[in-house]
C-alpha cells in the first residue's frame, strides 16, 4: 500500500510537507499540542481535503468551523486534489483551544505532487495508470485477482548469441522488449521540486538476482535502455526534471520460482527529502508494485499438437516415414534431429519437456532441458531454444542422477477437479520409488522442488521404480475424448492381456503366435498362458500398476469409467545392481504418441487372428469409439529392443491452455 510520512504539526512555526495525490497523509495534531489545550479546529485551502476521524465535533462555531477534542483515538489525514504548480502553494491551519488560554495557531505549507508507479496489475496486457488508493503491493490469485506478471526472459532473440536473453544486460530489439513487462513512473511536481527531493527505485537485496529493470531513455536503440536494477544493483536514483514527466521501465525475470524463491518480486519507489545536507535523507513517501514470475507450465496430451520432434538414427527410416505420415495428418510440424546431432541417442522424450510461460501481453514456449546429458544434450540449446522459444534447466552432478531424472518420467494430466478442488491446468505426474532403500531410485529433489514451486500444476508422486527404465510413461498415458470428461487415462494392464488371451484360447486360437514376421522366437497364446513364471511376474507388475491406479483415482478425482486398460505383458530382468525390474514383453502400447485424434501406437506384434492382430483390435475397440484414429507403428528393432517405444522416441510442442494460470487459486 502506498504510504506517506506522518506530518507533525509545530505550533507557532510553519511546517513544510509533501503530499502525494491519491494518498491519505496522516497529520499528527495531538502529539505537538501545547499543554493545557483540549480541542482544535482545522481549515485548509481549497486544494486540500481534510478528514477527521472522530465522533461528532464538540462545538460548531457561528462561522461554521468545527472543533474536535484532542482524544487518543483522533486521526487526521490530508489529501491533495492535484499536484502543485509551485512549492508550498497549499495551506492547512490548525488552531488549538484551551479553557483558560488564548488560541494557538500552527501553519502547514503543503506541496502536492503526483507520483505513481504503474504496471499491468489488472492483467489486461496494457499498463493503465495506477488507480488512487488501490493496493499494488499485494499479489492475489483468481479471476478477480490483482498483481503484475513477469516473464523470465529465457529465449534467445539473436541466434548467434551464446546464451539466453536475460544472461546479458542489453536489450536487443523490440522483440526482446516484448518478453519484458512494462512499468511506468509518472511524476508531476513543481519545477524546482527535485532540487530538494530524490526518487529511488529499489528491489529487496535478497531478490536483486531474480530481476532486471531497464530504464528507457531518449535515444536510439539499443543504447536507449539502461540497466536500473539487477544482480549488481538493488537501488537506482532517478534524476528527474520537475513538471510533468513519465519514465518507462521494462522488467525481465531472471529466475523461475524454486524451492528458495516463491516468485514474488516487489519493486518500490521511495521519495526522499534531502533538503538538509546535515541530515540523512528522510523517507517522505513509498509505493510498491509486486510482480509474480510466471510459472513454467506443462501441456497434457489433450492439448492440440503444434510440432513433433524425433531423431534420425541408423535404421529408423521406416519409423520416420510412419511418423511423418501421422504428423502430416495431425497438421503439425515435424522436426528431425539429424544423426550427427544426436550421437545415437534417440530418446527425445527423455531429453526435454516442452511447456510454456505466459503473461497477459505474451506467451512463450519454453523447453525444460533434463539434467540427463547424453547424445541429445545439445539439442534443446542448439535447435529448440531461439527467438520466441525459451529455455530452462536444472544442472545436477552426473553422480547424483538416476534414470528417473529423465523426462519420460515427467507427465501431466489433463485438467481435473478433485473433491471440489479444481486443477484447471492439470497435475504433474512424476515417478519415484515406492519406499526408500539403498537401491531405490527417485526423481532428484531439485527437480521435484522446481516442479512444485511453479504452484499451478501440483505434482502427484507415483511409483515407477519397479520398472527397468523407471518412467511413468511406461504404464500410463492420456487420450482426448469427445465427452464431458474430455479425456481417458490409459493404464497398461497384464490382467486385461491375460483375459484377452484366455478368451482367444477358449475360442480355439491357442496356437496363434506373437512376434510373427520378426526375427525372434515366436510364442503361442498357449505357451504364454502356461508360463507360470511369466504369470507370477505379471501379477507383481499388476500390483504395482494397481497401486498407481489408486493414487491416480484419488489425486486426479477419477472414476473407473475414466480409465481404459490397455492389454500389456511385462517380464522381469536383473538391472545393473542385480534387482529384478520390469520390461515390456512385447512393444508397450501405452507408450504412444498422441496428436489430437491421431494416435501413434507401438505395433505390438500380437497374435494374428482372422488376418488382424488381436492386441491392435482390442485397443482399437476401446479408442476408436472415442473418435480416435489408431496407427500402429513398428518400433520393434529401433526402439523396443532398447527398452523404449514411440513416446520415448518423440516429443511434442503443444498449444498452451486458453485458461490463464493467474485465474486459478493454487
Amino acid at each position: 500500500m502506498a504510504q506517506g510520512a506522518v506530518i507533525h504539526v509545530a505550533p507557532e512555526q510553519p511546517t513544510h510537507a509533501v503530499c502525494v495525490v491519491g494518498t491519505a497523509t496522516p497529520l499528527d495534531v495531538r502529539g505537538s499540542a501545547p499543554k493545557g489545550y483540549t480541542t482544535f479546529g482545522i481549515t485548509a485551502s481549497p486544494g486540500v481535503i481534510v478528514d477527521v476521524i472522530h465522533g461528532p465535533p464538540v462545538k460548531k462555531s457561528t462561522m461554521g468551523a468545527s472543533k474536535w477534542p484532542l482524544d487518543p483515538e483522533l486521526e487526521v489525514t490530508l489529501q491533495v486534489k492535484a499536484a502543485s504548480s509551485r512549492t508550498d502553494d497549499e495551506k492547512v491551519r490548525v488552531s488549538y483551544y484551551g479553557p483558560k488560554t488564548s488560541p494557538v495557531q500552527a501553519l502547514i505549507y503543503i506541496t502536492g505532487v503526483e507520483l505513481s508507479l504503474s504496471a499491468d496489475v489488472t492483467r489486461t496486457g496494457r499498463v493503465k495508470p495506477a488507480q488512487a488508493g488501490k493496493d499494488q503491493s499485494t499479489w492475489t490469485w483468481g479471476p478477480g485477482g490483482r498483481g503484475a506478471i513477469l516473464l523470465v526472459n529465457c529465449d534467445k532473440e539473436d541466434p548467434q548469441a551464446s546464451g539466453m536473453d536475460f544472461e546479458d544486460d542489453k536489450i536487443l530489439d523490440n522483440k526482446d522488449l516484448q518478453d519484458m513487462s512494462p512499468m511506468t513512473l509518472s511524476t508531476k511536481t513543481p519545477k524546482d521540486f527535485f532540487e530538494k527531493y530524490q526518487l529511488v527505485l529499489e528491489v529487496p537485496k535478497a531478490k536483486m538476482n531474480r530481476v532486471r529493470v531497464f530504464r528507457a531513455t531518449r535515444g536510439k536503440l539499443p543504447s536507449r535502455y539502461k540497466v536500473a536494477l539487477g544482480p549488481q544493483q538493488f537501488s537506482y536514483c532517478l534524476e528527474l526534471p520537475g513538471g510533468q514527466h513519465s519514465t518507462d521501465f521494462y522488467v525481465e525475470g531472471l529466475a523461475f520460482p524454486d524451492a528458495d524463491f516463491k516468485g514474488l518480486i516487489p519493486l518500490t519507489i521511495s521519495l526522499l527529502d534531502k533538503s538538509n545536507p546535515e541530515l540523512p535523507e528522510a523517507l517522505v513517501f513509498q509505493d510498491s508494485v509486486t510482480f509474480r514470475v510466471a510459472p513454467w507450465i506443462m501441456t497434457p496430451n489433450t492439448q492440440p499438437p503444434q510440432e513433433v520432434y524425433v531423431c534420425r538414427v541408423s535404421d529408423n527410416e521406416d519409423f520416420l516415414k510412419s511418423l511423418a505420415t501421422l504428423t502430416k495428418k495431425a497438421k503439425c510440424k515435424l522436426t528431425v534431429c539429424p544423426e550427427e546431432e544426436n550421437i545415437d541417442d534417440q530418446w527425445m522424450q527423455d531429453e526435454m519437456e516442452i511447456g510454456y510461460i505466459q503473461a497477459p501481453h505474451k506467451t512463450l514456449p519454453v523447453v525444460f532441458d533434463s539434467p540427463r546429458d547424453r547424445g541429445l544434450k545439445d539439442f534443446p540449446v542448439k535447435r529448440v531454444m531461439g527467438p520466441n522459444f525459451g529455455y530452462v534447466t536444472r544442472k545436477l552432478y552426473m553422480s547424483e542422477l538416476t534414470g528417473l531424472d529423465a523426462f519420460g518420467n515427467l507427465e501431466v494430466s489433463p485438467p481435473v477437479t478433485v473433491r471440489g478442488k479444481e486443477y484447471p491446468l492439470g497435475r504433474i505426474l512424476i515417478g519415484n520409488s515406492g519406499y526408500s532403500s539403498s537401491e531405490s531410485r527417485d526423481m532428484h529433489q531439485a527437480l521435484q522442488d522446481f516442479l512444485s514451486a511453479q504452484q499451478v500444476q501440483a505434482p502427484v508422486r507415483l511409483f515407477s521404480d519397479w520398472l527397468f527404465v523407471g518412467h511413468v510413461d511406461e504404464f500410463l498415458s492420456f487420450v482426448p475424448a469427445r465427452d464431458k470428461q474430455g479425456f481417458r487415462l490409459l493404464l497398461s494392464s497384464p490382467r486385461a492381456c491375460y483375459q484377452l488371451f484366455q478368451e482367444l484360447q477358449s475360442q480355439g486360437h491357442g496356437e496363434a503366435t506373437l512376434f510373427e514376421g520378426l526375427k525372434r522366437k515366436r510364442q503361442t497364446i498357449n505357451e504364454i498362458l502356461s508360463n507360470k513364471k511369466l504369470r507370477d511376474q505379471n501379477a507383481y507388475v499388476e500390483s504395482c500398476i494397481d497401486w498407481n491406479r489408486a493414487v491416480l483415482k484419488r489425486e486426479l478425482g477419477l472414476a473407473e469409467g475414466d480409465i481404459i486398460d490397455i492389454p500389456q505383458l511385462f517380464k522381469l530382468a536383473g538391472n545393473s545392481r542385480g534387482n529384478s525390474k520390469a520390461q515390456a514383453f512385447f512393444p508397450n502400447m501405452v507408450n504412444m504418441l498422441v496428436l489430437g485424434k491421431y494416435l501413434g501406437i507401438p505395433k505390438p506384434f500380437g497374435p494374428i487372428i482372422d488376418g488382424h492382430c488381436c492386441l491392435e483390435e482390442e485397443v482399437r475397440s476401446h479408442l476408436e469409439p472415442l473418435g480416435l484414429h489408431c496407427t500402429f507403428i513398428n518400433d520393434f528393432y529401433t526402439y523396443h529392443v532398447y527398452n523404449g517405444e514411440v513416446h520415448c522416441g518423440t516429443n511434442v510442442r503443444r498449444k498452451p491452455f486458453t485458461f490463464k494460470w493467474w485465474h486459478m487459486v493454487p
Epitope: R312, K333, L334, V336
Partner: antibody
Framework: EVQLQQPGAELVKPGASVKLSCKAS????????IHWVKQRPGRGLEWIGR????????KYNEKFRTKATLTVDKPSSTAYMQLSSLKSEDSAVYFC???????????WGQGTTLTVSS | DIVLTQSPASLAVSLGQRATISCKAS??????????MNWYQQKPGQPPKLLIY???NLESGIPARFSGSGSGTDFTLNIHPVEEEDAATYYC?????????FGGGTKLEIK
C-alpha cells in the same frame, strides 16, 4: 508458405557439368527435406533423390547415383543438384520439391529446363 | 523397382460427372497399415501439385471433390463432380520403397 526459385533454363555442352539451384524464401529452410525430380517430354516423372535437413540423410535413386550430387547451403537457403558428364538424354525439366514430412512433396519449384547440346 | 501402372492413359469426362483413375503397383506399398501412395496433379507449364497423400488423405487446401482409396497394390483417385479446372495430367507415386516411383500419368480432358 515456402516459395522455391529455380532458374528458368540452362544450356550446357555434352560432357560438361551443371549445378542447378533452388532457393527457398523460408528462413526455416533447415527443417525441410529437399527432393529433385526429372521430367522429360512425354516420359513422366522420375525421382532423383533427396537431401535431409541440415544436410543429413541423403538418399539417391541408384539410377542417378553417379549422375547427381545433392548439396545445400544453409546461409543462403539454397539447395543444389550437380549433374555431371552430361548427355543429350539428360535434357529435361528438373524440379526441386520441398517436404515438411520426409517424402510428401508439399512445395515445388517451377523447374529448370536443362538443354544439353553442342 | 516398384512399377506403377496407371489406367487409363487418358480419359474425357463431362462436367459434373465422376472421373476415376486407377494405379496398380507391382508389389504392395503398404507399411504399418498405411498405403504409401500419393496422387499429384500437373497442368501444362506448371510443377506437380500434391492432392492425396497416404492413399486417402486430402492435402490441405485441396477441394473435397478429390478423394483417394485403396491398399496393397490397388489404388484409385476419384474426382466428383469434375470441374473445368480439373483438366490436367494426374500421377500416382509410391514412397514405400527406394527408389520412389511415379506412374506414367493419366490425362484428364473435360467434355
Amino acid at each position: 508458405e515456402v516459395q522455391l526459385q529455380q532458374p528458368g533454363a540452362e544450356l550446357v555442352k555434352p560432357g560438361a557439368s551443371v549445378k542447378l539451384s533452388c532457393k527457398a524464401s523460408d528462413h526455416t529452410f533447415t527443417t525441410y527435406w529437399i527432393h529433385w525430380v526429372k521430367q522429360r517430354p512425354g516420359r513422366g516423372l522420375e525421382w532423383i533423390g533427396r537431401i535431409g535437413p541440415n544436410s543429413g540423410g541423403s538418399k539417391y535413386n541408384e539410377k542417378f547415383r553417379t549422375k547427381a550430387t545433392l548439396t545445400v547451403d544453409k546461409p543462403s537457403s539454397t539447395a543444389y543438384m550437380q549433374l555431371s558428364s552430361l548427355k543429350s538424354e539428360d535434357s529435361a525439366v528438373y524440379f526441386c520439391a520441398f517436404s515438411n514430412y520426409l517424402d510428401y512433396l508439399d512445395y515445388w519449384g517451377q523447374g529448370t529446363t536443362l538443354t544439353v547440346s553442342s | 523397382d516398384i512399377v506403377l501402372t496407371q489406367s487409363p492413359a487418358s480419359l474425357a469426362v463431362s462436367l459434373g460427372q465422376r472421373a476415376t483413375i486407377s494405379c496398380k503397383a507391382s508389389q504392395s506399398v503398404d507399411h504399418d497399415g498405411e498405403g504409401y501412395m500419393n496422387w499429384y496433379q500437373q497442368k501444362p507449364g506448371q510443377p506437380p501439385k500434391l492432392l492425396i497423400y497416404a492413399a486417402s488423405n486430402l492435402e490441405s487446401g485441396i477441394p473435397a471433390r478429390f478423394s483417394g482409396s485403396g491398399s496393397g497394390t490397388d489404388f484409385t483417385l476419384n474426382i466428383h463432380p469434375v470441374e473445368e479446372e480439373d483438366a490436367a495430367t494426374y500421377y500416382c507415386q509410391q514412397i514405400n520403397e527406394d527408389p520412389y516411383t511415379f506412374g506414367g500419368g493419366t490425362k484428364l480432358e473435360i467434355k
